[in-house]
């Protein structure tokens, strides 16, 4: 019969023959022949291969370097890579999470719209009319101005996006 030019899924072509690929978690040590199966070997500790493959070397698990603010979120197996995330207060600089930066703080006049996670930075928003933030913070939202009326007081100083209103007593002369 004619030698194959293409092989089935989970097979590869070598020496005019279709050989089985190695399953995830194993690497290739010997190709198949007319008389023998493909020979595969499990990946070692701290190594992985996540696809059906014909690799002769397994990949090293990613190292979550604490000096870069990284820690292990999910330990790697022979079939999966280690997943890193950032220490509390830090977030990844890229999708691959190779290093971390400190969460951004929202300046006065801005509040936290979305608190940062290990993979995303703080999202700030300007405080709208009626709200303020007088601190630089990675957690604080914009606070509503104090309602002087509910305290039976009057506004003595208008609020801004950075300051609360100042309430004072009612003017007694006005009867």
């Amino acid at each position: 019969p004619e030698p194959p030019t293409a092989c089935r899924e989970k097979q590869y072509l070598i020496n005019s023959q279709c050989c089985s690929l190695c399953q995830p978690g194993q690497k290739l040590v010997s190709d198949c022949t007319e008389f023998t199966e493909t020979e595969c070997l499990p990946c070692g500790e701290s190594e992985f291969l996540d696809t059906w493959n014909r690799e002769t070397h397994c990949h090293q698990h990613k190292y979550c370097d604490p000096n870069l603010g990284l820690r292990v979120q999910q330990k790697g197996t022979s079939e999966t890579d280690t997943i890193c995330t950032c220490e509390e207060g830090w977030h990844c600089t890229s999708e691959a999470c190779e290093s971390c930066v400190l969460h951004r703080s929202c300046s006065p006049g801005f509040g936290v719209k979305q608190i940062a996670t290990g993979v995303s930075d703080t999202i700030c928003e300007p405080c709208p009319v009626g709200f303020f933030s007088n601190v630089s913070s990675a957690f604080e939202k914009c606070h509503p101005w104090t309602s002087c009326e509910t305290k039976d007081l009057v506004v003595q100083q208008a609020g801004t996006n950075k300051t609360d209103v100042v309430c004072g007593p009612q003017d007694r002369l006005r009867a």
């Epitope: 040590v29 199966e37 499990p42």
Partner: antibody
Framework: QVQLQQSGAELVRPGVSVKISCKGS????????IHWVKQSHARRLEWIGA????????TYNQKFKGKATMTVDKSSSTAYMELARLTSEDSAIYYC????????????WGQGTLVTVSA | DIELTQSPAIMSASPGEKVTITCSAS?????MHWFQQKPGTSPKLWIY???NLASGVPVRFSGSGSGTSYSLTISSMEAEDAATYYC?????????FGAGTKLELK
């Protein structure tokens, strides 16, 4: 028939190295990886590692990294293992083995090489 | 590493007696293989892929198990069965062996 012929017994001094061999015959040598297994006096079997006879890539048990070095000479159908900086702990029988034509198990073993480390 | 714990370490059985050797893995494996070794000889493949007898192995031998628990059974002990039996996993690197069970004839 498939044969794995190992080199003879070695009596060596502590601190030196020894290189033992395993010659494959009765099959195409590059079709199968060669594995090395240590059997100490306690009769315990320990997998040292394996070497691809075709690609030359070696895989080691972490425990034997720096102790064992596996190589292959395709032209003579022979696999070698060198053991470095020998101590009494390395005194053991060392076997080479290969799997069968199908499946992941050691179907064929060499006769073993006894390495004795003694001053 | 996947640790394989065999029990018992040593046992003796009379001819005709049923013998069971167990092998417990520290984490789950797909299959277990068994080797027989007699003094002064290399290990011999005895049972592969948990329950398949290697060529020339008498049918009184059988293997079973799954996950972390495996066993080798001899339905009726014979003198020639006296040997050391080792379980072995090829599932995770480093490949590992049990410490062996020495089976003696009573």
């Amino acid at each position: 028939q498939v044969q794995l012929q190992q080199s003879g017994a070695e009596l060596v001094r502590p601190g030196v190295s020894v290189k033992i061999s395993c010659k494959g015959s009765g099959y195409t040598f590059t079709d199968h990886a060669i594995h090395w297994v240590k059997q100490s006096h306690a009769r315990r079997l320990e997998w040292i590692g394996a070497i691809s006879t075709n690609y030359g890539a070696a895989t080691y048990n972490q425990k034997f990294k720096g102790k064992a070095t596996m190589t292959v000479d395709k032209s003579s159908s022979t696999a070698y293992m060198e053991l470095a900086r020998l101590t009494s702990e390395d005194s053991a029988i060392y076997y080479c083995a290969r799997r069968g034509s199908h499946g992941d198990w050691f179907a064929y073993w060499g006769q073993g090489t006894l390495v004795t480390v003694s001053a | 590493d996947i640790e394989l714990t065999q029990s018992p370490a040593i046992m003796s059985a009379s001819p005709g007696e049923k013998v069971t050797i167990t092998c417990s893995a520290s984490s789950s494996v797909s299959y277990m293989h068994w080797f027989q070794q007699k003094p002064g000889t290399s290990p011999k493949l005895w049972i592969y892929s948990t329950s398949n007898l290697a060529s020339g192995v008498p049918v009184r031998f059988s293997g079973s198990g799954s996950g972390t628990s495996y066993s080798l059974t001899i339905s009726s002990m014979e003198a020639e069965d006296a040997a050391t039996y080792y379980c072995h996993q090829y599932h995770r690197s480093p490949l590992t062996f049990g410490a062996g069970t020495k089976l003696e004839l009573k």
